[in-house]
């Protein structure tokens, strides 16, 4: 009897694990084995697929094969007994495109009102994701064990802290990874649960803000109790995404160690140009608070978020406003390569009724104006970032008269 070739071959790739599954074509024939060959793009010869020769089941693992994961390959399978079936060819595929992201590893640490989450890829030193390790983002679902009401948190990194939790409460969570530039979203980790600790005697500092005065940064925060000492630490923001990096160490700001007030002042040259995280801790000599929520601190935005400069072209029923880069001293424009949004306030010169337009474009139309009427305009810039809301001061008001009727073109 002729052996039929197997059908419906499925290739499952999760991280660096390559699994093949197929259907037997003829269940009635016993003692059949199956073998695979593979072929790389641009080659004529077929090569035996190690790990998938003379298989008695309908599943095999060819993870040991060292493939270029970006190169297309083709597979074929046949059944073998005394004779062999014809080959069945599987559609060619590129391993990287087919690969799914496996569940990440998750390690939790509890504080009284926060949980620190350490996330790492499920496969250490993965070949599949070797070029993308730092591009992983993660999302999680967290719930109180007692209620089961889920909260989703998107767009987090390898080290994340969830704040504003209740003390002595068990929380459960699961995490999945994503490689968004390849449209890949992985599968969830197993559920991990942890109980937050008993409430700490000292709460962490709150409402941390950074401002610039002269050549210094001024860091301020709020605290519940008097007669405390505080310390401030900083970290390069990019290390959040690469906590395995040996540089992942929070460092002290020298002028902000053991300060007795709820602010500290340090020179701008303490930080090179870049993006940092800052955190503050309180102590009364005997007890220490947990660290505050981390704030993001961007030296360029802190130092140079200046009010926008704009020109107005007046028509009879509208203004066209053209926003340019703000000028530094010496009349050189400031290069702002972070995303900004513009708030434009305008009002009739004889009235206090202000109207507002918010726009991300740098050319804006202010509509529905009356002819031959003086209107005043001022503008400010805002950054668009979830962790860092920074606004410039308003520009000086500029007042212009609209043209007579019928000049709206």
């Amino acid at each position: 009897k002729n052996l039929k070739s197997p059908q419906k071959v499925e290739v499952d790739i999760i991280d660096d694990n390559f699994i093949l599954r197929w259907n037997r074509s003829d269940e009635s024939v016993g003692n059949v084995t199956f073998s695979f060959d593979y072929q790389k793009t641009g080659m004529d010869n077929w090569i035996k697929l190690s790990g998938c020769q003379n298989i008695t089941s309908t599943k095999c693992n060819f993870s040991s094969l060292k493939l270029n994961v970006y190169e297309e390959i083709k597979l074929r399978i046949r059944a073998e007994k005394e004779n062999t079936s014809s080959w069945y060819e599987v559609d060619s595929f590129t391993p990287f495109r087919k690969a799914q992201i496996g569940p990440p590893e998750v390690h939790l640490e509890a504080e009284d009102k926060a949980i620190v989450i350490h996330i790492s890829p499920g496969t250490k030193d993965s070949v599949m994701w070797a070029l993308d390790g730092l591009s992983f983002t993660y999302s999680l679902v967290i719930w109180k064990n007692s209620s089961g009401v889920e909260e989703r948190i998107e767009n987090i990194y390898s080290r994340h802290k969830i704040y504003k939790l209740s003390p002595e409460t068990t929380y459960c969570l699961k995490v999945k990874a994503a490689l968004l530039t390849s449209w890949k979203i992985g599968v969830y980790s197993p559920v991990h649960c942890i109980k937050t600790t008993v409430e700490n005697e000292l709460p962490p500092p709150e409402n941390i803000e950074v401002s610039v005065q002269n050549q210094n940064y001024v860091l301020k925060w709020d605290y519940t109790y008097a007669n405390m000492t505080f310390q401030v630490q900083w970290l390069h923001a990019f290390l959040k995404r690469n906590p395995g990096n040996h540089l992942y160490k929070w460092k002290q700001i020298p002028d902000c160690e053991n300060v007795k007030t709820t602010q500290c002042v340090f020179p701008q040259n303490v930080f090179q140009k870049g993006i940092y995280l800052l955190r503050v801790q309180a102590s009364d000599g005997n007890n220490t608070s947990f660290w505050s929520e981390e704030i993001k601190f961007d030296t360029e935005i802190q130092a140079f978020l200046l009010p926008p400069v704009f020109n107005i072209r007046s028509l009879s029923d509208s203004f066209h406003i053209y926003i340019g880069a703000p000028k530094q001293s010496g009349n050189t424009p400031v290069i702002q390569d972070y995303p900004l949004i513009y708030e434009i306030i305008f009002w009739e010169n004889t009235s206090n009724a202000e109207r507002k337009i918010i726009e991300k474009k740098t050319d804006v139309t202010v509509p529905n104006l009356k002819p031959l009427t003086v209107y005043c305009v001022k503008a400010r810039a805002h950054t668009m970032d979830e962790k860092l809301n920074k606004s410039s001061v308003f520009s000086d008001a500029v007042c212009e008269k609209t043209k007579p009727g019928n000049t709206s073109k």
Epitope: N155, N242, P339
Partner: nanobody, 126 residues
């Protein structure tokens, strides 16, 4: 904040067609691309199709040749034309925008984030 509004879902017979739309409003400064994912009951959310800021398209193997993704940049809208629908295409379809924080100013500082729509139900009956 970005809002994504999907529409076009519904009940259709096997072999039929649907066209999903997703309009993005709000501020997306450096969009990488827009795409569609789907989630069937009891299953993980899976990628369906994506189109990046140029015209590069990506499709899941299961929908290749049947589904077509397109986008209208002027309207900030992405479409998914679904033909030859099968019962296994039944799922909630989610629109997604992937964006980045723009030109990196410091080492390793380009990150990618995703915004999700609320989802639209597609049911294919046999």
């Amino acid at each position: 904040q970005v809002q994504l509004q999907e529409s076009g879902g519904g009940l259709v017979q096997a072999g039929g067609s649907l066209r999903l739309s997703c309009a993005a409003s709000g501020y997306i400064f450096y969009p990488f691309g827009m795409g569609w994912y789907r989630q069937a009951p009891g299953k993980e959310r899976e990628f369906v199709a994506g189109i990046n800021d140029g015209t590069t398209t990506n499709y899941a193997d299961s929908v290749k040749g049947r589904f077509t993704i397109s986008r209208d940049n002027a309207k900030n809208t992405v479409y998914l034309q679904m033909n030859s629908l099968k019962p296994e295409d039944t799922a909630v379809y989610y629109c997604a925008v992937v964006y980045t924080n723009g030109p990196a100013r410091t080492r390793g500082d380009n990150y990618y984030h995703i915004y999700w729509g609320q989802g639209t139900q597609v049911t294919v009956s046999s």
